[in-house]
Interface confidence: medium
């Protein structure tokens, strides 16, 4: 399937609109600090060049790889060294090292201002004045803040973003129509970004085999009626798509994702009965719908797993002949029978099975050795079940905010060296597992909760990797992808931590807190809570609860005061004194 000109091939496959959007995303994800106008200029230059190649594939430079073309273009940016420092050194390298170098400099936490939402009328005017620029700016702002955002999915978000403005800017009450839609897109976007970040981390840190194992388990749960060969084909194609997107090959990724959606819809009879509605939708909606489709019903008469994987005398023979295929079949068979298990649990079971076979197939009596392998699964299954039960009970007792606070305290005591903003962000997201998953019946709780926690803990891992401060975090993040959550769960209070010096400035608050949204006010309070624990890591739950109650009363009191700033200054001193007394300082 070789083409004389790769850039012409992708331009023709994707069409000009998607081509330009994807190149903009790619550039913004690489050069996250560059102004919007600079990126638009680069994209226009690449697009004009692509058009010349479409007209004549033999034209000069049209035979170059996309990495070469895009890398050359990025390296023309005049301020590269001043803005990006050592990233400019990438430009001295040849492909493929140059692209690898750009990838390594992607920043999961770029120093960019928070996106402030303008007034609805201002947004609607901007949308009407120049729709194309308005939508490009959306792609640019999301892509530079989320350098691993799944590019074809970002096109889907942009389509919904456009639809929201098209509808709501004509509505009688623009704000009532638009704001909930924008909130939904923002929340879904953050979730989508985090999920994709885990896929990329899986591929980049643990390799293709780890990603394929994850995909086998998840697709087998989703398509339990599909044959193993069918699931294997989908896994291979899906791995290619995500490898490309995570590697910055966004044009190839989007093209291959469209091909995969087409294949799935053409073969839905042998894949899943749940795909019909998805397959009637336009391309971007179709791909999104397939990715989110509910699990198909399990075939009625699936035989016991033990026959093929424990009782059979051919277990070691089959394993030796093709280890990964045999383990893949085990994972497929187990996963299609267990939509009630998290993917990470299924992968732990498969790893236990693999370890047992490695040991037993070299033993004098292999069958005797692996006969009880399924008994080893019981504690692995019960551990997340018990953890979820306990935490859902705690969530139901406390509500989301106080549950987040309990997790903040728990995680700050485990890894107090981690920066306060990271602990707040991660613990808030961990706490959202309650409202997201505890409402589900037992059969759906574990896949919802544990796979969500994997996504959130990956955020901690990628943020920590940028500036490593805790050996314990590094250990949990790097030793095993599937055991990250149990590793963090098992961490106790870090006894080696030297408490932070008390700094009154950290606990000084001003009247601006009164005008913050409820969410922002919570974050302020939770930031103070983390600092409190870092300052007094041995504080009891009751002590911390007491101080936080005092803090809430203080904010409530001063926000009702006539002279708020004076109240915050005077009452703040009393609060600090009372808090120090409460904590025995």
């Amino acid at each position: 399937d070789a083409h004389k000109s790769e850039v012409a091939h992708r331009f023709k496959d994707l069409g000009e609109e998607n081509f330009k959007a994807l190149v903009l995303i790619a550039f913004a994800q690489y050069l996250q600090q560059c102004p919007f106008e600079d990126h638009v200029k680069l994209v226009n230059e690449v697009t004009e060049f692509a058009k010349t190649c479409v007209a004549d594939e033999s034209a000069e430079n049209c035979d170059k790889s996309l990495h070469t073309l895009f890398g050359d273009k990025l390296c023309t940016v005049a301020t590269l060294r001043e803005t990006y420092g050592e990233m400019a050194d990438c430009c001295a390298k040849q492909e493929p090292e140059r692209n690898e170098c750009f990838l390594q400099h992607k920043d999961d936490n770029p120093n960019l201002p928070r996106l402030v939402r303008p007034e609805v009328d201002v947004m609607c005017t901007a949308f009407h004045d120049n729709e194309e620029t308005f939508l490009k700016k959306y792609l640019y702002e999301i892509a530079r803040r989320h350098p691993y955002f799944y590019a074809p999915e970002l096109l889907f978000f942009a389509k919904r973003y456009k639809a929201a403005f098209t509808e709501c800017c004509q509505a009688a009450d623009k704000a009532a129509c638009l704001l909930p839609k924008l909130d939904e897109l923002r929340d879904e976007g953050k979730a989508s970004s985090a999920k994709q970040r885990l896929k990329c981390a899986s591929l980049q840190k643990f390799g293709e085999r780890a990603f394929k194992a994850w995909a086998v388990a998840r697709l087998s749960q989703r398509f339990p009626k599909a044959e193993f060969a069918e699931v294997s084909k989908l896994v291979t194609d899906l791995t290619k798509v995500h490898t490309e997107c995570c590697h910055g090959d966004l044009l190839e990724c989007a093209d291959d994702r469209a091909d995969l959606a087409k294949y799935i819809c053409e073969n839905q009879d042998s894949i899943s009965s749940k795909l019909k509605e998805c397959c009637e939708k336009p391309l971007l909606e179709k791909s999104h719908c397939i990715a989110e489709v509910e699990n198909d019903e399990m075939p009625a008469d699936l035989p016991s797993l033990a026959a093929d994987f424990v009782e059979s005398k051919d277990v070691c023979k089959n394993y030796a002949e093709a280890k990964d295929v045999f383990l893949g079949m085990f994972l497929y068979e187990y996963a299609r029978r267990h939509p009630d298990y998290s993917v990470v649990l299924l992968l732990r079971l498969a790893k236990t099975y693999e370890t047992t076979l490695e040991k037993c197939c070299a033993a004098a009596d292999p069958h005797e050795c692996y006969a009880k392998v399924f008994d080893e699964f019981k504690p692995l299954v019960e551990e997340p079940q018990n953890l979820i039960k306990q935490n859902c009970e705690l969530f139901e007792q406390l509500g989301e905010y106080k549950f987040q606070n309990a997790l903040l305290v728990r995680y700050t005591k485990k890894v107090p060296q981690v920066s306060t903003p990271t602990l707040v962000e991660v613990s808030r997201n961990l706490g959202k597992v309650g409202s997201k998953c505890c409402k589900h019946p037992e059969a759906k709780r574990m896949p919802c909760a544990e796979d969500y926690l994997s996504v959130v803990l990956n955020q901690l891992c990628v943020l920590h990797e940028k500036t490593p401060v805790s050996d314990r975090v590094t250990k949990c993040c790097t030793e095993s992808l599937v055991n990250r959550r149990p590793c963090f769960s098992a961490l106790e209070v870090d006894e080696t931590y030297v408490p932070k010096e008390f700094n009154a400035e950290t606990f000084t608050f001003h009247a601006d807190i009164c005008t913050l949204s409820e969410k922002e006010r919570q974050i302020k309070k939770q930031t103070a809570l983390v600092e409190l624990v870092k300052h007094k890591p041995k504080a009891t739950k009751e002590q911390l609860k007491a101080v936080m109650d005092d803090f809430a009363a203080f904010v409530e009191k001063c926000c009702k005061a006539d002279d708020k700033e004076t109240c915050f200054a005077e009452e703040g001193k009393k609060l600090v004194a009372a808090s120090q007394a409460a904590l025995g300082l």
């Epitope: 005092d550 809430a552 009363a553 409530e556 009191k557 009393k574 609060l575 009372a578």
Partner: nanobody, 123 residues
Framework: DVQLVESGGGLAQAGGSLRLSCAAS????????MGWFRQAPGKEREFVAT???????SYATSVQGRFTVSRDIAKNTVYLEMNNLKPEDTAVYSC?????????????????WGQGTQVTVSS
Amino acid sequence: DVQLVESGGGLAQAGGSLRLSCAASGRTFSNECMGWFRQAPGKEREFVATIRSTGHISYATSVQGRFTVSRDIAKNTVYLEMNNLKPEDTAVYSCGAGVSDYGCYRTSGYNYWGQGTQVTVSS
């Protein structure tokens, strides 16, 4: 000076309810926190619940969801509604009044105390 008088204690079955009252006289408490504490035989006095001048309410974890503190400013009275009582709730319950909005969960945060009322929960 300030006088605090508790009432409403007595004997209750496990799972039952009681309502304690704390009437204050001497001067008003619009700028202070009023709280309930309890002391079981051989144990230290422990925090139960408080209501502050702002109306902000706090509970000890052990009673959260079972006990409700409220006040009637006109009557200068604070109440403690106790539901789903357990044998471990058996203690002398005292009412306190403090002059600061902070530290309402520590005995040292209170300047005035009532004489207490006995609550006994049988299983």
